[in-house]
């Protein structure tokens, strides 16, 4: 398809590595949210860290290729990793402009489908890339 995908771009302070090189940051006239136009895919992603009381965005941007899940119109996150006890990383992929701005819903921590508390543990920076 000819038109390029545009996604929300965000990287939380302290996140190791960057997906900035997967697109071209746009001047949207506002400080936030930032927008990125994808170079290598038509697919956005988002990563949220869900703890007992809140969900915090960790990363948003472009994927490096089109993969299963990229055909989704909306961001429907699924659990991917445990950066620390009591928190779970959820990721989504989707294929419409700015579809990664927010998620449609997150299952509550510990609900079916969430990795068990004995799931893989990782250092915070590593867990982001595990999730991706």
């Amino acid at each position: 398809p000819p038109n390029r995908r545009t996604c929300v771009f965000f990287e939380a302070p302290g996140v190791r590595g960057s997906t900035k090189t997967l697109g071209e940051l746009l001047d949207t006239g506002t400080e936030l949210p930032r927008a990125i136009r994808c170079l290598y895919s038509r697919c956005c992603f988002g990563i949220w860290n869900l703890t007992q009381d809140r969900a915090q965005v960790e990363m948003q941007g472009c994927r490096d290729s089109d993969e299963p899940g990229c055909e989704s119109l909306h961001c429907d996150p699924s659990p991917r990793a445990h950066p620390s006890p009591g928190s779970t990383l959820f990721t989504c992929s989707c294929g419409t402009d700015f579809c990664n701005a927010n998620y449609s819903h997150l299952p509550p921590p510990g609900s079916p489908g969430t990795p068990g508390s004995q799931g893989p543990q990782a250092a915070p920076g590593e867990s982001i890339w595990m999730a991706l």
Partner: antibody, heavy 117, light 111 residues
């Protein structure tokens, strides 16, 4: 700095496959960038042919999609162009180019390929 | 594909002249207000050299006498005071849609 150098035969027979190599120095082709092939016809028109990305994904100009393959050898820091079933209309100067964004900041010097029997 | 039309196809000018080259796209090359139009200079026997990216941004090392402007479908490359080394062919390129496409070129010759 990033440097690119094209190499390959300057003469190809009609219906055969054109094969070119681009050797990149000063930068790893797996680090970043799209690695492109662009050609310039004798009438001076420029055509973007396609790229292989740092991650190995490819994108091709639809006008060439049935005939073009771009691949790479990461151990040699090279990427390749294959264009099958060539005709005289494929006679051109072929450039490889590196792009961090969607414009072309780094170019090879170009190599002339003539298609003739 | 987006068609890029440059005008004029050639022009004659003298050192010190102000030169303007235009490029018109068959459809808008803007994404959310950002113009994906770029300009190159090519001298005989050499590869094209990037001058301007995203309509108006000067590539590092390019003299400030070169400037770009425009949005949507109509763009302009201006050389404020033509120098002897500026006699060359100039191309525009859009990257708003795949496949990337180039204009046919404008040859700037010595009057």
């Amino acid at each position: 700095q990033v440097q690119l150098q094209e190499s390959g035969p300057g003469l190809v027979k009609p219906s055969e496959t054109l094969s070119l190599t681009c050797t990149v120095s000063g930068y790893s082709i797996t680090s970043d960038f799209a690695w492109n092939w662009i050609r310039q016809f004798p009438g001076k028109g420029l055509e973007w042919m396609g790229y292989i990305s740092f991650s190995g994904s490819t994108s091709y100009n639809p006008s060439l999609k049935s005939r073009i393959t771009i691949s790479r050898d990461t151990s040699k820091n090279q990427f390749f162009l294959q264009l099958s079933s060539v005709t005289a209309e494929d006679t051109a100067v072929y450039y490889c180019a590196g792009s961090r964004y969607s414009w072309f900041a780094y170019w090879g010097q170009g190599t002339l390929v003539t298609v003739s029997s | 594909d987006i068609q890029m039309t440059q005008s004029p196809s050639s022009l004659s000018a003298s050192v010190g002249d102000r030169v303007t080259i235009t490029c018109r796209a068959s459809e808008s090359v803007d994404t959310y207000g950002n113009s994906f139009m770029h300009w190159y200079q090519q001298k005989p026997g050499k590869a094209p050299k990037l001058l301007i990216y995203r309509a108006s941004n000067l590539e590092s090392g390019v003299p400030s006498r070169f400037s770009g402007s425009g949005s949507g479908t109509d763009f302009t490359l201006t050389i404020s005071s033509l120098q002897p080394e500026d006699f060359a062919t100039y191309y525009c390129q859009q990257s708003n849609e795949d496949p990337y496409t180039f204009g046919g070129g404008t040859k700037v010759e010595i009057k």
